[in-house]
C-alpha cells in the first residue's frame, strides 16, 4: 500500500530513508536537457524475496537533442561499491536497515539523473530527519517519521524535532544529544502525495532542503 502523503514538513529540516521497503517506487527523472528514452521505464521498483531485495527496471536518460544516445542506469559493481561508501549509516541504528530483509538500499545514480529524487513510499517506511546547515536540533524523541495505516488511511507519525537557528549542524539521524523538549505537534495532515528528496543529501549531509514538492525552485 502506497502512502498517500509526504512525510511531515519540519522547518529547516530535510529527511531521507536509510533503506526502502519493498514496493517503494522511484521516478525515473532526467536532468534538464535530457529525457527518458522513448520506451523507458517511468519508475524503479524495490522488489525481492525474503532473502534479497533489489531495484527492478532501469532508468535511462538520453539527450533531448540526440535521439539515439542512451545512458546506462546501473554502474559496474566496482563503481557501485565506490558510490556506496558515500552513503550515511546511522549510528543510532543497531541494524543496518539496508541489509534488512524486504528493504532496498539507495539506488545507484544513473547518468544524467535529475538532482532530486521522487519516491513513492509504502506503509511501514521510516524516514529520518536532520536540520539543515546552520540549524541545531532540539528533540525530545526520535527524529523520525513512519508511514502507518490507521482505519484504512495512511498517515505519517510526527517527528519530535525542532531546528533552531544556531550555527551548529546535527548529524543524520539524531546524533545530536537531546535538548529541550518541544511540544509534539499534531499528526501530519499534509496533502503532498509524492516525496522528492534532494539527492545531494545522500552524499552531502549539510545540503539545504530543496524538496520539489514543497518548493517550486527545482523540482
Amino acid at each position: 500500500e502506497l502512502c498517500d502523503d509526504d512525510p511531515p514538513e519540519i522547518p529547516h529540516a530535510t529527511f531521507k530513508a536509510m533503506a526502502y521497503k519493498e514496493g517503494t517506487m522511484l521516478n525515473c527523472e532526467c536532468k534538464r536537457g535530457f529525457r527518458r528514452i522513448k520506451s523507458g521505464s517511468l519508475y524503479m521498483l524495490c522488489t525481492g524475496n525474503s532473502s534479497h531485495s533489489s531495484w527492478d527496471n532501469q532508468c535511462q536518460c538520453t539527450s533531448s537533442a540526440t535521439r539515439n544516445t542512451t545512458k546506462q542506469v546501473t554502474p559496474q559493481p566496482e563503481e557501485q561499491k565506490e558510490r556506496k561508501t558515500t552513503e550515511m549509516q546511522s549510528p543510532m541504528q543497531p541494524v543496518d536497515q539496508a541489509s534488512l530483509p524486504g528493504h532496498c538500499r539507495e539506488p545507484p545514480p544513473w547518468e544524467n539523473e535529475a538532482t532530486e529524487r521522487i519516491y513513492h513510499f509504502v506503509v511501514g517506511q521510516m524516514v529520518y530527519y536532520q536540520c539543515v546547515q546552520g540549524y541545531r536540533a532540539l528533540h525530545r524523541g526520535p527524529a523520525e517519521s513512519v508511514c502507518k495505516m490507521t482505519h484504512g488511511k495512511t498517515r505519517w507519525t510526527q517527528p519530535q524535532l525542532i531546528c533552531t537557528g544556531e550555527m551548529e549542524t546535527s548529524q543524520f539521524p539524531g546524533e545530536e544529544k537531546p535538548q529541550a523538549s518541544p511540544e509534539g505537534r499534531p499528526e501530519s495532515e499534509t496533502s503532498c502525495l509524492v516525496t522528492t528528496t534532494d539527492f545531494q543529501i545522500q552524499t552531502e549531509m549539510a545540503a539545504t532542503m530543496e524538496t520539489s514538492i514543497f518548493t517550486t525552485e527545482y523540482q
Partner: nanobody, 126 residues
Amino acid sequence: QVQLVESGGGLVQAGGSLRLSCAASGIPFDNYAMGWFRQAPGKEREFVAARDLEGIITRYGDSVKGRFTISRGNAKNTVFLQMNSLKPEDTAVYYCAARDGGVVAGSRSSAQYNYWGQGTQVTVSS
C-alpha cells in the same frame, strides 16, 4: 506540437456529478503522467489527481479523495476525471496537465508538469 484539450465542464448542483475529459496529442512518449489541477479565483493552483497512462501509480488530492476518480480512456492519450458528490468548494477552472515522467503529486507539484491545457470551468451551485 503538444496539445491538451479539456471538455466536460459546466454548471451542476451540489451533490451532482460531472465527467471531465482531456485529450492529448503530440506527446512523443510511450508512457507519461497526466494530471488534473484546479484553480479557484484568488487561490493557488491545487493538485486534484494524477496517474500514469499504464495505471502504475494513481494519486489524489486530499480534498477530492473518495469522490473523484481519474481514469484512462480507450484511446491511450485520453484521461477522464469523474467527479461525484460535488460541493460548492469544488468550483474552479480545471486544467489538464502532462509530464514526461512518472506521477508527481501534491500541493506544489504543478511546476513539474510541462504541458497544460486551457482549462474548463466547473461551477457547483448550492
